[in-house]
C-alpha cells in the first residue's frame, strides 16, 4: 500500500482543516488508514483522524482544531496499521479556504432598490471576521446569458443594486462567496442560493 498523491490540506481558519490524498489502488480509508496530527506546541496532544473514502482510491479527513492562529504548525503522519506511509507538516494560515457566508436574504421592499444581506461566517474574535471581502453572483433562471458578479470590497456583508439593472417580471437567483486577501486565501464555496421575483415600476414615458 502506497500513497500516490500526498495529502494536501486546507483550513477554514476556525475549527476544521480538510486533508485529501490518493492511494495507489482501491482503499477502504476508514478501516485501513489513520491520519495523526499534532500541534507543534507545549503540551499539545496527538489527535487521530479517521478518513473517509473520496472516490475509489481517494481519502479525505476532517481535522478538528482549536483556536487556530497564524503561528500554528501541525505535524501529520499517515499510518496503515503499523506502517508509516507518509510524514509531513501543515501550517493552517498558509492554506486557508474561508467558510461560506450564510443567511443570504434579498430585501425587495426598498423603493426599487434590491438589498442583499448575508452573514459573516466568522465570530468577531476571529482574525478573518474583519478581513473578508465577497463576490455576489446573480443570474436569471430564464436566461443563462444574464449572469453577473458583483465584487463587495468593503466589510459590510451587504449589497445594494437598483432593481432596474435587472429585467422586470422574471425570477433571479443569488449566491455569495468570500475570500481574505490578508492570508491569500482561496475562495470559499458558494453559499446556498436564494430566489426572488424581480419587479419594479417602469418610469413613465414622457
Amino acid at each position: 500500500m502506497k500513497v500516490l498523491q500526498e495529502p494536501t490540506c486546507v483550513s477554514d481558519y476556525m475549527s476544521i482543516s480538510t486533508c485529501e490524498w490518493k492511494m495507489n489502488g482501491p482503499t477502504n480509508c476508514s478501516t485501513e488508514l489513520r491520519l495523526l496530527y499534532q500541534l507543534v506546541f507545549l503540551l499539545s496532544e496527538a489527535h487521530t483522524c479517521i478518513p473517509e473514502n473520496n472516490g475509489g482510491a481517494g481519502c479525505v479527513c476532517h481535522l478538528l482544531m482549536d483556536d487556530v492562529v497564524s503561528a500554528d504548525n501541525y505535524t501529520l503522519d499517515l499510518w496503515a496499521g503499523q506502517q508509516l506511509l507518509w510524514k509531513g507538516s501543515f501550517k493552517p494560515s498558509e492554506h486557508v479556504k474561508p467558510r461560506a457566508p450564510g443567511n443570504l436574504t434579498v430585501h425587495t421592499n426598498v423603493s426599487d432598490t434590491l438589498l442583499l444581506t448575508w452573514s459573516n461566517p466568522y465570530p468577531p474574535d476571529n482574525y478573518l471576521y474583519n478581513h473578508l471581502t465577497y463576490a455576489v453572483n446573480i443570474w436569471s433562471e430564464n436566461d443563462p446569458a444574464d449572469f453577473r458578479i458583483y465584487n463587495v470590497t468593503y466589510l459590510e456583508p451587504s449589497l445594494r443594486i437598483a432593481a432596474s439593472t435587472l429585467k422586470s417580471g422574471i425570477s433571479y437567483r443569488a449566491r455569495v462567496r468570500a475570500w481574505a486577501q490578508c492570508y491569500n486565501t482561496t475562495w470559499s464555496e458558494w453559499s446556498p442560493s436564494t430566489k426572488w421575483h424581480n419587479s419594479y415600476r417602469e418610469p413613465f414615458e414622457q
Partner: antibody, heavy 116, light 111 residues
Framework: QVQLVQSGAEVKKPGASVKVSCKAS????????MHWARQAPGQGLEWMGI????????SYAQKFQGRVTMTRDTSTSTVYMELSSLRSEDTAVYYC?????????WGKGTLVTVSS | QSVLTQPPSVSAAPGQKVTISCSGG????????VSWYQQLPGTAPKLLIY???KRPSGIPDRFSGSKSGTSATLAITGLQTGDEADYYC????????????FGTGTKLTVL
C-alpha cells in the same frame, strides 16, 4: 464576552502556600490554554507556566519547578495556581491569561503579599 | 533577567509619534512571533499587537507592530494622554524547551 475572574488578595507568612483561582466564562474552556504570570511591585512581567485545560497537562518555568502546581476543574471552568514555600520575593500580583502563542485575555490579577 | 531588552522609558507630546524597540536573539524573536501588551496604571496587561503586526479587534490603527531579524518595534502615532502606560513585548524562546518571554518593559510618558 470572555471573562477571567480571579480570587481575592491573600496575605501569607513565609514558608506557607497560596492557591489562586481563575474562573473562565464566555468561551469554550477546554479549547484554550491558560498561562500564569506574575508582576512584583514596580517590576516587569514574569511567566510562570501554562496548563492545557483539555487534558490538564502542564509546563512550568524552570524557576518555579517544584514549587508551583497548576490544576483545572472543567466542571466549573476554573484553573488554579498553587505556589508553595513562599518567601518575601514572591510578593506580587498573579495573573491568569488565556491564549496560546500570545495572551488574548487577562484576569484582573490577585495580589499575594508574603510577610512575617 | 529578561533576554528581551526594551528602553526603560520613552516620552513624546500629544499628537506625536513614538516607537518602542524590543531587542532579542535568534532563538527567540528571530525564530518566533512577537506580541505587544499595554498595561495602564493599576490594571492588567492588554493584548495590543500579535503575530508581529496584527491588531485585535478594538485596538485602533494608531498602534502598529513590525519585526526585522532579531528585533521588533511598536509604533504609536497620534499620541493621546490615555496612551500613558507600560508596554511589554512578548515572544517565545525556542532554544531548548519552548517557553514564553516578556520584555523588560517600557514606560511611555505623554508630555
Amino acid at each position: 464576552q470572555v471573562q477571567l475572574v480571579q480570587s481575592g488578595a491573600e496575605v501569607k507568612k513565609p514558608g506557607a502556600s497560596v492557591k489562586v483561582s481563575c474562573k473562565a466564562s464566555g468561551y469554550a474552556f477546554t479549547s484554550y490554554y491558560m498561562h500564569w504570570a506574575r508582576q512584583a511591585p514596580g517590576q516587569g512581567l514574569e511567566w510562570m507556566g501554562i496548563i492545557n485545560p483539555s487534558g490538564g497537562s502542564t509546563s512550568y518555568a524552570q524557576k518555579f519547578q517544584g514549587r508551583v502546581t497548576m490544576t483545572r476543574d472543567t466542571s466549573t471552568s476554573t484553573v488554579y495556581m498553587e505556589l508553595s514555600s513562599l518567601r518575601s520575593e514572591d510578593t506580587a500580583v498573579y495573573y491568569c491569561a488565556r491564549g496560546k502563542w500570545w495572551l488574548y485575555n487577562w484576569g484582573k490579577g490577585t495580589l499575594v503579599t508574603v510577610s512575617s | 533577567q529578561s533576554v528581551l531588552t526594551q528602553p526603560p522609558s520613552v516620552s513624546a507630546a500629544p499628537g506625536q509619534k513614538v516607537t518602542i524597540s524590543c531587542s532579542g536573539g535568534s532563538s527567540n524573536i528571530g525564530n518566533s512571533y512577537v506580541s505587544w501588551y499595554q498595561q495602564l496604571p493599576g490594571t492588567a496587561p492588554k493584548l495590543l499587537i500579535y503575530d508581529n503586526n496584527k491588531r485585535p479587534s478594538g485596538i485602533p490603527d494608531r498602534f502598529s507592530g513590525s519585526k526585522s531579524g532579531t528585533s521588533a518595534t511598536l509604533a504609536i502615532t497620534g499620541l493621546q494622554t490615555g496612551d500613558e502606560a507600560d508596554y511589554y513585548c512578548g515572544t517565545w524562546d525556542t532554544s531548548t524547551t519552548m517557553y514564553p518571554l516578556f520584555g523588560t518593559g517600557t514606560k511611555l510618558t505623554v508630555l
